[in-house]
Amino acid sequence: LGCDLPQNHGLLSRNTLVLLHQMRRISPFLCLKDRRDFRFPQEMVKGSQLQKAHVMSVLHEMLQQIFSLFHTERSSAAWNMTLLDQLHTGLHQQLQHLETCLLQVVGEGESAGAISSPALTLRRYFQGIRVYLKEKKYSDCAWEVVRMEIMKSLFLSTNMQERLRSKDRDLGSS
């Protein structure tokens, strides 16, 4: 990927998903009535014409927003601190690497628009999640719904990263 995002970035993303799964505190079966349409911007991760700058920007903003969401007093009160610390550490490592990559990609002349546009869209999406948590008074079920939503959106974003990596491999081998 541009700065050749290494295999361990994909591994870190999968570890983040594993941690989010382990963080589960209550049965989701208790929370069906709390479901909400957060309107994840699927078009941002589903396209076939993937630019390096776009992919990195989406991943960076996703991870930044997840880090912020799970780095609050409310979050500390809701989740197991050991798992939360591991999540923070993993996210921080991924963010550092992505920031290096983004600088390199911008240096290579890819458009700044490809970077700023997904960031704004994702900020709106995460703002909706924050509003929901506040509306639901940060209940256990609200956090459970959010945890599963974050897992879904991170899974889709990670898939986008894998698609770009395999596209790069195909180009390299042809």
Partner: antibody, heavy 121, light 107 residues
């Protein structure tokens, strides 16, 4: 292509045990729950229970609690429905269907083809 | 448990007719209501989810409306392939429950 493929029809005697299966493919099996639905001959649909294959957490309809066991093996993307002692009244078509869990997405959007279970002496 | 009551239990209609099936929940379920079509010997097929969202691949002659306790499935112009049994199902809370079904027959 998303598919749920169920095991074949079964003919059993009262008191026998049985385990039927539902294999998912074409999607991330652990990202969706699997529900089971019964349809007795000429009757309507009855929800039996559901499983989260990611950790095998289950929920049952009170009508079926203790009568059946739902399980899953995520390593082979398969969910199961089992009986330890069948009764003639268990004769029915059994369907599995996938559910998006707490995500805002269509419920039971894909169904298995059904497994006909006949219990007769 | 949330009880789901469908009406009518059966109806006869002709090709081209506008058909309406209603479903009532015993308590408010917001918009957590799905509609399925089932043909003899086949698995049910999802038509409408969250009361009014048309499932991908389902013809636009099918539509759903309602919220709270009262819901409606409408077929704007009945086609030969629409003769089947229709079920509503609440997905608001466990245990999930279905209506008893409405059989749409040829007049």
């Amino acid at each position: 292509e998303v598919q749920l493929v169920q095991s074949g029809a079964e003919v059993k005697k009262p008191g026998e045990s049985l385990k039927i299966s539902c294999k998912g493919s074409g999607y991330s099996f652990t990202s969706y729950w699997i529900g089971w639905v019964r349809q007795m001959p000429g009757k309507g649909l009855e929800w039996m229970g559901i499983i989260d294959p990611s950790d095998s957490d289950t929920a049952y309809s009170p009508s079926f609690q203790g009568q059946v066991t739902i399980s899953a093996d995520k390593s082979i993307s398969t969910a199961y429905l089992q009986w330890s002692s069948l009764k003639a009244s268990d004769t029915a078509m059994y369907y599995c269907a996938r559910h998006p869990g707490l995500n805002w997405a269509p419920d039971f959007d894909y169904w298995g083809q059904g497994t006909l279970v006949t219990v007769s002496s | 448990d949330i009880q789901m009551t469908q009406s009518p239990s059966s109806l006869s209609a002709s090709v081209g007719d506008r058909v309406t099936i209603t479903c009532r929940a015993s308590q408010s379920i917001g918009s957590a209501l799905n509609w399925y079509q089932q043909k003899p010997g086949k698995a049910p097929k999802l038509l409408i989810y969250f009361a009014s969202s048309l499932q991908s691949g389902v013809p636009s002659r099918f539509s759903g409306s309602g919220s709270g306790t009262d819901f409606t499935l409408t077929i704007s112009s009945l086609q030969p392939e629409d003769f089947a049994t229709y079920y509503c199902q609440q997905s608001y809370d466990f245990p999930l429950t279905f209506g008893q079904g409405t059989k749409v027959e040829i007049k």
